[in-house]
Interface confidence: medium
């Protein structure tokens, strides 16, 4: 068990031409926050696939408002580290996705609006307990500088956080046969007493230098399945007459995989591909049941009705798959109404509403004209999620506050002359034309 820690140092325009001045518009203040997603191994998976090692969301950073004309300052960042706890062993190789989000804090109806500014991804090797690693990543015109590390939570230590150390209350309190953990001098650990190379999966030891094998395994290092061990005499009879294997067998000779499993050799040993309903190193364990805890992410396990289905996982909201292992793309259900933009932030679902709509799912159609006065005798017209004013003659603009020049648009056709009048405009038509706009 341990914690992956991410420290964001800076986020801003990268070098080179075309870089944006600021993530915030000059009109609206905004603030930044970050999301990190971790996956074991060197996966090339999409960002939407589950963050199997964990994910974290930063706090919101300080509010920033761009000052037009002023030099672009360093963007204020959220305080503190992003921390992703991991319960199992640290995998050593991992993939990360870091997203930079912008929260606009203007006077939008329906609250703040979120948008994804940049997403960077990478694959790294990292030992737990090591120093901070620094990194720079670019996404489009943006540049992100950050550091990261993995550290173990006591009593776990080691590069994978799998060695267990016992805290000691005073110097020299390590028990017999125990020595201080390096480099943590205030903890004790049992020395590795098994014979060098003894398989940790199939062997164990109680005395220094020994390697005792679990059932089904043999050899000095417990790496040879019992069913593939060769005859005692290297020149012994063939397996056809005695059932004894000829010397120097491959690890798959005699097929150590039970229950119809197929065997394939690996550099160290062998690997069984088990048929449905069997698992274990040699497919020796049958029928995964609820006792095996097959349902992830809080899924409820119920025994299946037929032998082919030994269990059924009832998944909590947000997860799917036979073992509740897949996160549902909640935005695919189109929960935001009235054209709202859906954002799945991992811990919560957010809808960014179009103007004129509000509510958690943009379900409320606001009265576009509420509190919107049209000046100078104009009348408010609602529609399309926004309001507009139908202005009295002689006035124009969004709120009818501007005195209009009725002749500015050259309304008189065919060379007619336009005259402004208190009630509107009058066209004096050229010879041969007539009508209010000289259109005939």
């Amino acid at each position: 068990a341990g914690v992956f820690e991410l420290q964001i140092h800076s986020f801003g325009p990268g070098p080179g031409p075309g870089a944006p001045r600021s993530p915030c518009s000059a009109r609206l203040p905004c603030r930044l926050f970050f999301r990190v997603c971790l996956k074991p191994g060197l996966s090339e998976e999409a960002a939407e696939s589950p963050c199997a090692l964990g994910a974290a969301l930063s706090a919101r950073g300080p509010v920033y408002t761009e000052q037009p004309g002023a030099p672009a300052p360093d963007l204020p960042l959220p305080d503190g580290l992003l921390q992703v706890p991991f319960r199992d062993a640290w995998p050593g190789t991992f993939s990360f996705i870091i997203e930079t989000w912008r929260e606009e804090l203007g006077d939008q109806i329906g609250g703040p609006a979120w948008s994804l500014l940049a997403r960077v991804a990478g694959r790294r090797r990292l030992a737990a307990g090591g120093p901070w690693a620094r990194d720079i990543q670019r996404a489009g015109a943006w540049e992100l500088r950050f550091s990261y590390r993995a550290r173990c939570e006591p009593p776990a230590v080691g590069t994978a956080c799998t060695r267990l150390c016992r805290p000691r209350s005073a110097p020299s309190r390590c028990g017999p046969g125990l020595r201080p953990c390096a480099p943590l001098e205030d903890e004790c650990e049992a020395p590795l007493v098994c014979r060098a190379g003894c398989s940790p999966e199939h062997g164990f030891c109680e005395q220094p230098g020994e390697c005792r094998c679990l059932e089904g395994w043999t050899g000095p290092l417990c790496t040879v399945p019992v069913s593939t061990s060769s005859c005692l005499s290297p020149r012994g009879p063939s397996s056809a007459t005695t059932g004894c294997l000829v010397p120097g067998p491959g690890p798959c000779d005699g097929n150590p995989c039970a229950n119809g499993g197929s065997c394939s050799e690996t550099p160290r040993s062998f690997e069984c591909t088990c048929p449905r309903g069997f698992y274990g190193l040699r497919c020796e364990v049958s029928g995964v049941t609820c006792a095996d805890g097959p349902c992830f992410n809080g899924g409820l396990c119920v025994g299946g009705a037929d032998p082919d289905s030994a269990y059924i996982c009832h998944c909590p909201p947000g997860f799917q798959g036979s073992n509740c292992e897949k996160r549902v793309d909640r935005c695919s259900l189109q929960p935001c109404r009235n054209g709202g933009l859906c954002l799945d932030l991992g811990h919560a679902l957010r809808c960014r509403c179009r103007a004129g709509f509000a509510g958690p799912r943009c379900e409320h159609d606001l009265d576009d004209c509420a509190g919107r006065a049209c000046a100078n005798g104009g009348t408010c017209v609602e529609g399309g999620g926004a309001h507009r004013c139908s202005c009295a003659l002689g006035f124009g603009g969004r709120d009818c506050r501007e005195r209009a020049d009725p002749c500015a648009a050259r309304p008189c056709a065919h060379g007619g002359r336009c005259y402004a009048h208190f009630s509107g405009l009058v066209c004096a038509c050229a010879p041969g034309y007539m009508g209010a706009r000289c259109e005939f």
Epitope: R87, L192, C205
Partner: nanobody, 118 residues
Framework: QVKLVESGGGLVQAGGSLRLSCTVS????????MAWFRQAPGKERQLVSL???????VYADSVKGRFTLSRDNAHSTAYLQMNGLKPEDTAMYYC????????????WGQGTQVTVSS
């Protein structure tokens, strides 16, 4: 500090049953390989059974078909159900734990005595 506490031992007649429990504290139980060993007077300590983190078990030939080892992650406890007990099963039974990336069982309980009379 990792602590293993065994219980359930006792005196039983041949053919009878006992259920040993081993409760772990101080570490995430799901991440531990659990095992039961036994040691009869004057004999070497012997692996009885082991249950991996995935839940699959292995057994010594002498107890196969009679003993069942299971784990209850919710209660951080491993159970050894012993049926059809024989006098030769008489021994001190020890619960042990380790991670699956290391060889040695680093964590041990104090042991519980099982005596089978004929």
């Amino acid at each position: 500090q990792v602590k293993l506490v065994e219980s359930g031992g006792g005196l039983v007649q041949a053919g009878g049953s006992l259920r040993l429990s081993c409760t772990v504290s101080g570490f995430t139980f799901d991440d531990l390989v659990m095992a039961w060993f036994r040691q009869a007077p004057g004999k070497e300590r012997q692996l009885v059974s082991l249950v991996a983190t995935a839940g699959n078990s292995v057994y010594a030939d002498s107890v196969k078909g009679r003993f069942t080892l299971s784990r209850d992650n919710a209660h951080s406890t491993a159970y050894l159900q012993m049926n059809g007990l024989k006098p030769e099963d008489t021994a001190m039974y020890y619960c042990a734990a380790r991670t699956d990336s290391e060889h040695a069982f680093k964590f041990w309980g104090q042991g519980t005595q099982v005596t089978v009379s004929s």
